[in-house]
Interface confidence: low
Amino acid sequence: CEEPPTFEAMELIGKPKPYYEIGERVDYKCKKGYFYIPPLATHTICDRNHTWLPVSDDACYRETCPYIRDPLNGQAVPANGTYEFGYQMHFICNEGYYLIGEEILYCELKGSVAIWSGKPPICEKVLCTPPPKIKNGKHTFSEVEVFEYLDAVTYSCDPAPGPDPFSLIGESTIYCGDNSVWSRAAPECKVVKCRFPVVENGKQISGFGKKFYYKATVMFECDKGFYLDGSDTIVCDSNSTWDPPVPKCLKVLPPSSTKPPALSHSVSTSSTTKSPASSASGPRPTYKPPVSNYPGYPKPEEGILDSLD
């Protein structure tokens, strides 16, 4: 027989020869970092037809590192599900806990023994310091000094000294999140009051009131013969300004045809219709009413005025 087979996990005992006699036996041993588990044989024999009898290194198993328990409030996850040398152990903390120490340990060989590269980490509870205090407001649990993961506080505004109340700008509730950081910035409390919105040649159709505070919403429509330039809905924003700005009602220019269209209703509210002037022949004005997809109104190609051309 020629040289005996080579393996990943076991090696020949002694030096190989170029040729072996029929009936000659060779023995293997497990390589460094592997250990033998019976009953599989680790030897082979040169048989009559000049081939080696079947043998494998299945009997040699990788050295394994000591078992590691899951850290308290966490998990130890062996990569590839194994503790064998050359592999890693990953550590994960449960939600609400964070890792102190190495996130990954390596199973390494020291001599012929497999040991971990370091100490297993621990999982500490995520804690947050009290959330920020805000001017003109307070939050729940203000007496608590330490907050745990997902603990929530809710902010509210103080009563205002004057006639107008404080408005809460931002999210009222925040919670203690990962990395001991509150989920978002604290809100603010301030007086937000928008001017009374006036639209000439139009009227308010909802959101009536004498005073308009934060998030007050007002809707408008234009009088007959006028169309809306801007948004039909405006909201009082945190800067005490209307967002979008208060719209205008502009006059619809009549078409330069002999028969003016009999408008059955006003052209208004962010309408997607064309103005008659833009549908008729003859000289056209330099403006065009804005086009949008305001729900409940026809799209430009379905304009209610098209049939009047």
């Epitope: 998990q75 994960i92 997902l150 999210e171 999140g177 990962d178 950081v181 509150w182 978002r184 910035a185």
Partner: antibody, heavy 117, light 112 residues
Framework: QVQLQQSGAELARPGASVKLSCKAS????????ISWVKQRTGQGLEWIGE????????YYNEKFKGKATLTADKSSSTAYMELRSLTSEDSAVYFC??????????WGQGTSVIVSS | DIVMTQAAPSVPVTPGESVSISCRSS???????????LYWFLQRPGQSPQLLIY???NLASGVPDRFSGSGSGTTFTLRISGVEAEDVGVYYC?????????FGGGTKLEIK
Amino acid sequence: QVQLQQSGAELARPGASVKLSCKASDYTFTSYGISWVKQRTGQGLEWIGEIFPRSGNTYYNEKFKGKATLTADKSSSTAYMELRSLTSEDSAVYFCARGLGGAMDYWGQGTSVIVSS
Amino acid sequence: DIVMTQAAPSVPVTPGESVSISCRSSKSLLHSNGNTYLYWFLQRPGQSPQLLIYRMSNLASGVPDRFSGSGSGTTFTLRISGVEAEDVGVYYCMQHLEYPCTFGGGTKLEIK
């Protein structure tokens, strides 16, 4: 390797509903949020909302309230988004992404939704 | 909602050159805890977005160190030192200081 596997493309009629899924693997599903992001053809990214599977808490972009509903099944490590009353404006690719505090570090491959009569 | 603005819709660049992509927020993204909640993503053609930078300046796992992020409370920059062909795509900034998370309109990096 962390993976988010999203369900296949959907073709739906206007007014109908669809439910998209996002199956997470190789991480602790309950330790992270799942965000959903919309992208219309040739357009930018729009955040729809986020669900925290451990608590079931959801946070929505106001624009998508009433349009999208986010749920999660801890037992199968799967997040879902249902879109209802579909219109052509809802035709887009929808991504799910793993994250906590905005760091959306792993994304699904996206699910295309086409709304057409 | 916080508005994120990426003024340049596209940036042409020669491979090997360095490039900066800017982003502006309508409100400071600096939290009182010292973190700035600004993130950068790259969406390569036909792919899902990929996280590059988190909390303004931290490099995400597996991202080459030719990418870096910097900025103040409202003005942010993503810098790529020595652009490679694989860097082409659309770069988005995103804030997570407040819900809803909002993205910039995107800046397309094109190779000259």
